[in-house]
C-alpha cells in the first residue's frame, strides 16, 4: 500500500452514495475512545476553502449526510474529517475525489406487480433523486441517466424464464398459466456508466381461471 498510517484515531473516510444520497462515513480506529469527537468539512474540486458542515461538528457518530452539499452530480467534491480525543492532537483525513454521477449505486426500482388470469403486469415507478434540475425540480434516475433501461425476468420454474427489456415503465408478461406462482425480478441498468441495481423481486400468483364455472 502507498500510505503508512499510524494515527489510529481515524480511518476509512469515504463517501457512500446510493441514488445520489451521499453519506460520509468513517471508522474510529484503535486509538479512538468514547470521548472522541469528529468534525466534517467539504469543498468542491479546485476550491481552496473548506466549508464546515453544520450539524456535523464535534459529533460522536461516524457518519454525516452531505447530500445537500454535494448535490451537483456533475461536480467533483472532497470531504474531510478531523478527529479529536482528550489529551491528543487532532487527526485529519480526507476522501478521494468524489463524483456522485460516477460513484453512486442504484437501488432496486420501486415496482408494482399486478397478477391477472393469464398475465402479470409490472409497473415501474419513477425514482426521484435529490439532484435538482436548473429550474429547481427533483430529477428522476431516468432524467439523469438517459441510457437507463429496465431488465425484467419472470421465473416460470427452475428451468424456464421469460425476459423483457425496455425504457418504458409498463410491462406485461403474457400467455401465463392461471393460478400459478411466478417469481419476477426487475433491474435498473445504465450501460454507459456500467451501473446495475440489485433486483426488485416480487412473488406473485396469477388469478384462477373462473370462466369454466359459468359455461
Amino acid at each position: 500500500h502507498t500510505t503508512v498510517d499510524t494515527s489510529g484515531l481515524l480511518q476509512h473516510v469515504k463517501f457512500q452514495s446510493s441514488n445520489f444520497e451521499n453519506i460520509l462515513t468513517w471508522d474510529g480506529g484503535p486509538a479512538s475512545t468514547s470521548d472522541t469527537v469528529y468534525s466534517v468539512e467539504y469543498k468542491k474540486y479546485g476550491e481552496r476553502k473548506w466549508l464546515a458542515k453544520a450539524g456535523c461538528q464535534r459529533i460522536t457518530q461516524k457518519f454525516c449526510n452531505l447530500t445537500m452539499e454535494t448535490r451537483n452530480h456533475t461536480e467533483f467534491y472532497y470531504a474531510k474529517v478531523t478527529a479529536v480525543s482528550a489529551g491528543g492532537p487532532p487527526v485529519t483525513k480526507m476522501t478521494d475525489r468524489f463524483s456522485s454521477l460516477q460513484h453512486t449505486t442504484i437501488k432496486p426500482p420501486d415496482v408494482t406487480c399486478i397478477p391477472k388470469v393469464r398475465s402479470i403486469q409490472m409497473l415501474v415507478h419513477p425514482t426521484l433523486t435529490p439532484v435538482l434540475s436548473e429550474d429547481g425540480h427533483q430529477l428522476t434516475l431516468e432524467e439523469i441517466f438517459h441510457d437507463l433501461f429496465y431488465r425484467l425476468e419472470l421465473h416460470v420454474n427452475h428451468t424456464y424464464q421469460m425476459h423483457l427489456e425496455g425504457k418504458q415503465r409498463e410491462y406485461e408478461f403474457l400467455g401465463l398459466t392461471p393460478d400459478t406462482e411466478f417469481l419476477g425480478s426487475i433491474t435498473i441498468l445504465t450501460p454507459i456508466l456500467s451501473k446495475e441495481s440489485a433486483p426488485y423481486v416480487c412473488r406473485v400468483k396469477t388469478l384462477p381461471d373462473r370462466t369454466w364455472a359459468y359455461s
Partner: antibody, heavy 116, light 113 residues
C-alpha cells in the same frame, strides 16, 4: 506557515534507483493532495503524479507509470517519490507541490542527475 | 493528453509597459459544473520553484500584485502584466487541470527591454 522540503537527490547511474522525500510542515499532510513535478535543466514543467495522503490513492502521468511510485508516511508527515530504472533523460529538478488541481505551495526542489 | 501552447516563447518589455502572454489549449478547459476554466498561471524566477499567480483562469492568488491579471475562456487564455516591474523578470507557465495528466505550457520568458 506551510513548508515543503525535498531531499534525496544526487548523482545516480543509469539503471539505478533513488527515493526522494518531501517533508511537509505547517499543516497535516493528510489534509491535501500532494504532487510531484519535475523540470529538466533549461526546460519546462512536467507533472509526474499525485497522491491522496489520507487514502494512498495515486494517479500518475502514464509516461511515468511503472517506473515511478508515490507514497506517504503519515506519521512523518512526508511524501516520497521512488524512481527506478533511471535514465539520462530523468535528469531534472524534482519538486513536490501541494493541492489537487493547481499547486499552491511548492518545495525548493531537489536535483537528480543520472549519469555514468 | 491536453497540449498547452504558449506564445511568444520570450518577450522584452520596457519597465512600466504592458506584457501579454498567450496560452492555447488543445481542447476546451471550461468546467461545465461551475462554468469556470481550469487554468492556472505560475511565475518562476531563476533558481526558485514556480509560484502560483492565477487560478480558475482569472482568480488572483492571495498576495499577488493586482498588476497581474488572467483572462480568456475555452481554449484561449491570456496573462497580462499591466505595468512591468523589474521583479517581474521570470518565466511564466500556464497549466491545465481539466483532466489527467495535468499539463503545462512550455513557458514564456519575460525580460526588460
Amino acid at each position: 506557515e506551510v513548508q515543503l522540503v525535498e531531499s534525496g537527490g544526487g548523482l545516480v547511474q543509469p539503471g539505478g534507483s533513488l527515493r526522494l522525500s518531501c517533508a511537509a510542515s505547517g499543516y497535516s499532510i493528510t489534509a491535501e493532495y500532494m504532487n510531484w513535478v519535475r523540470q529538466a535543466p533549461g526546460k519546462g514543467l512536467e507533472w509526474i503524479g499525485e497522491i491522496n495522503p489520507s487514502t494512498g490513492t495515486t494517479t500518475y502521468n502514464q509516461k511515468f507509470k511503472g517506473r515511478f511510485t508515490i507514497s506517504v508516511d503519515q506519521s512523518k508527515n512526508t511524501a516520497y517519490l521512488q524512481m527506478n530504472s533511471l535514465r539520462a533523460e530523468d535528469t531534472a529538478v524534482y519538486y513536490c507541490a501541494r493541492f489537487d488541481a493547481y499547486f499552491d505551495y511548492w518545495g525548493q526542489g531537489t536535483l537528480v542527475t543520472v549519469s555514468s | 493528453d491536453i497540449v498547452m501552447t504558449q506564445s511568444p516563447d520570450s518577450l522584452a518589455v520596457s519597465l512600466g509597459e504592458r506584457a501579454t502572454i498567450n496560452c492555447k489549449s488543445s481542447q476546451s478547459l471550461l468546467y461545465s459544473s461551475n462554468q469556470k476554466n481550469t487554468l492556472a498561471w505560475y511565475q518562476q524566477k531563476p533558481g526558485q520553484p514556480p509560484k502560483l499567480l492565477i487560478y480558475w483562469a482569472s482568480s488572483r492568488e492571495s498576495g499577488v500584485p493586482d498588476r497581474f491579471s488572467g483572462s480568456g475562456s475555452g481554449t484561449d487564455f491570456t496573462l497580462t502584466i499591466s505595468s512591468l516591474q523589474a521583479e517581474d523578470v521570470a518565466v511564466y507557465y500556464c497549466q491545465q487541470y481539466y483532466s489527467y495528466p495535468f499539463t503545462f505550457g512550455q513557458g514564456t520568458k519575460v525580460e526588460i527591454k
